[in-house]
């Protein structure tokens, strides 16, 4: 007996060959020998079956002998075995009905569970694996699952569910809500305008939801909010903003905030999350804010960095166009009795500068003394 | 450690008048709004008002307005409720919370202090 | 103002039971929504905020869930010290309102 495999939702089409090249009359019934459909002349003729709205055939075939029975919109019950009468034969064709569908939602945050459930009829005994865009393969029985969803995971997962060596094919697309970063970090002078940027990873017509900034300033001893705001429909209005700093917010995606200047009280970590609408829990980003000061005091020159530093990050002092005076895996470094000229605190990783800020050393004239 | 003690309650006649104060520690006071919340006895609990880090903004539930003011002193570190007008249905006890929580939760609360206006 | 409705009002179970109390708003409040526990004679304490986050020294028995207008509070398996009242609290607009309360109690 001929095995076919079927989507669920999808439409089958079941073959039936006549050895004639011509309309002759054909039955096609169910196991329970209901009469689905069949002809009477050139007439399309249906039986009492379930299928009756769902079932045809393809008159144009019927001249070359072949009387095909489609089955649209495929439900899981519909799978049975199907027998052709034509000619004093029959041909037995079963045909099995598969669903896969996701869940709850296609759209899921990052670091949560997709389950993938497969439906398949009785008595089957289906295996599926199931292909993720990032070329990850998983395997299983009726359901598939897969903890901590990451950004590459967003895309069209591919399945295929084996029946009696017959595979049949899905396209599940997953997207997963996430920001495009992780985490970032921003390098400023002490003073200079600070610009924070959180952008989606995703885009969805309408996006609405809420949000926070929550602060930790390396200085401080407890963490506290810089900012509370609503998304409706892309468009963002603050809630509540911290009387210090006094952070402005843009109106639009992506989210962006703007602290007017960078002090050192400010340096630290925050976590934006956000909520979205009909969803459990929360995308976050973590952004970090590294603040550089120079300054000469009397015979000191000294140059500071607060905030969230890596220990192999290195702090220089140098005068313009020469060797680093002083060079340390430390966040304050300090030359004494400076030679006058333009100085340079440098904050690098591996050579590469991240952060540089110049202070001018005059020069100091001795006062003669008083005879 | 956080802690907000609550002073002040008492009982008052119908009409009559009661300041509340909360003294604060343990976290800087100036930088978190401050709420009042109230709960009659067996009953549930009712947001009372609130003030902004230096108290230029203040928001009151509809049954107090214009009876109850809240102030704050950050110098003092303290958190107050001047309660004029007092109605029996204003027995109950009340607390001092600190809005630090995220998402604008309240997130610490004092131990309370009873109202009580009666006859 | 918007009117939070707890349901039910109280509810029985045994220690290790799975309790879950609604908390419905009466228009869209985002996630602008925490829980509060509440022991006898003493002041309420903060379990849940933003709707689904977890305070900090809350065991993790207690869960959140929702956004919207419909909210969750889930105890998976009740200790002897759960046997409380159970509070929602709206933070989207003032006067910030909280639900009428559920007390759990033992069968």
């Known amino acids: 007996k001929k095995v076919v495999l079927g989507k669920k939702g999808d439409t089958v089409e079941l073959t039936c060959t006549a050895s004639q090249k011509k309309s002759i009359q054909f039955h096609w019934k169910n196991s329970n020998q209901i009469k689905i459909l069949g002809n009477q002349g050139s007439f399309l003729t249906k039986g009492p079956s379930k299928l009756n709205d769902r079932a045809d055939s393809r008159r144009s075939l019927w001249d070359q002998g072949n009387f095909p029975l489609i089955i649209k919109n495929l439900k899981i019950e519909d799978s049975d075995t199907y027998i052709c009468e034509v000619e004093d034969q029959k041909e037995e064709v079963q045909l099995l009905v598969f669903g896969l569908t996701a869940n709850s939602d296609t759209h899921l945050l990052q670091g949560q569970s997709l389950t993938l459930t497969l439906e398949s009829p009785p008595g089957s005994s289906p295996s599926v694996q199931c292909r993720s865009p990032r070329g990850k393969n998983i395997q299983g029985g009726k359901t598939l699952s897969v903890s901590q969803l990451e950004l590459q995971d967003s895309g069209t997962w591919t399945c295929t569910v084996l029946q009696n060596q017959k595979k049949v094919e899905f396209k599940i697309d997953i997207v997963v809500l996430a920001f495009q970063k992780a985490s970032s970090i921003v390098y400023k002078k002490e003073g200079e305008q600070v610009e924070f940027s959180f952008p989606l990873a995703f885009t969805v017509e309408k996006l609405t939801g809420s949000g926070e900034l929550w602060w930790q300033a390396e200085r401080a001893s407890s963490s506290k909010s810089w900012i509370t705001f609503d998304l409706k429909n892309k468009e963002v209005s603050v809630k509540r903003v911290t009387q210090d700093p006094k952070l402005q917010m843009g109106k639009k995606l992506p989210l962006h905030l703007t602290l007017p200047q960078a002090l050192p009280q400010y340096a630290g970590s925050g976590n934006l999350t956000l909520a979205l609408e009909a969803k459990t829990g929360k995308l976050h980003q973590e952004v970090n804010l590294v603040v550089m000061r120079a300054t000469q005091l009397q015979k000191n020159l000294t140059c500071e960095v607060w905030g969230p530093t890596s220990p192999k990050l290195m702090l220089s002092l140098k005068l313009e166009n020469k060797e680093a005076k002083v060079s340390k895996r430390e966040k304050a470094v300090w030359v004494l009795n400076p030679e006058a000229g333009m100085w340079q605190c440098l904050l690098s990783d591996s050579g590469q500068v991240l952060l540089e800020s110049n202070i001018k050393v005059l020069p100091t004239w001795s006062t003669p003394v008083q005879p | 450690e956080v802690q907000l003690v609550e002073s002040g309650g008492g009982l008052v006649q119908p009409g009559g008048s009661l300041r509340l104060s909360c003294a604060a520690s343990?976290?800087?006071?100036?930088?978190?709004?401050m709420s009042w919340v109230r709960q009659a006895p067996g009953k549930g609990l009712e947001w009372v008002a609130n003030?902004?880090?230096?108290?230029?903004?203040?928001y009151y539930v509809d049954s107090v307005k214009g009876r109850f003011t809240i102030s704050r002193d950050n110098a003092k570190n303290s958190l107050y409720l001047q309660m004029n007008s007092l109605r029996a249905e204003d027995t109950a006890v009340h607390y001092c919370?600190?809005?630090?929580?995220?998402?604008?939760?309240?997130?610490?609360w004092g131990q309370g202090t009873l109202v009580t206006v009666s006859s | 103002d918007i009117q939070m409705t707890q349901s039910p009002s109280s509810v029985s179970g045994s220690v290790g039971d799975r309790v879950t109390i609604t908390c419905r708003a009466s228009q869209g409040i985002s996630s602008w929504l925490a829980w509060y526990q509440q022991k006898p004679g003493k002041a309420p304490k903060l379990l849940i905020y933003?709707?689904?986050s977890l305070q900090s020294g809350v065991p993790s028995r207690f869960s959140g869930s929702g956004s919207g207008t419909d909210f969750t509070l889930t105890i998976s398996s009740l200790q002897p010290e759960d046997f409380v009242t159970y509070y929602c609290?709206?933070?989207?607009?003032?006067?910030?309102?909280f639900g009428q309360g559920t007390k759990v109690e033992i069968k």
């Open positions: 003030i902004k880090e230096d108290g230029s903004d203040k």
């Open positions: 609290q709206q933070a989207n607009s003032f006067p910030w309102t």
């Open positions: 343990g976290f800087t006071f100036s930088s978190y709004w």
């Open positions: 933003g709707a689904s």
């Open positions: 919370v600190r809005e630090g929580g995220q998402w604008l939760a309240l997130d610490y």
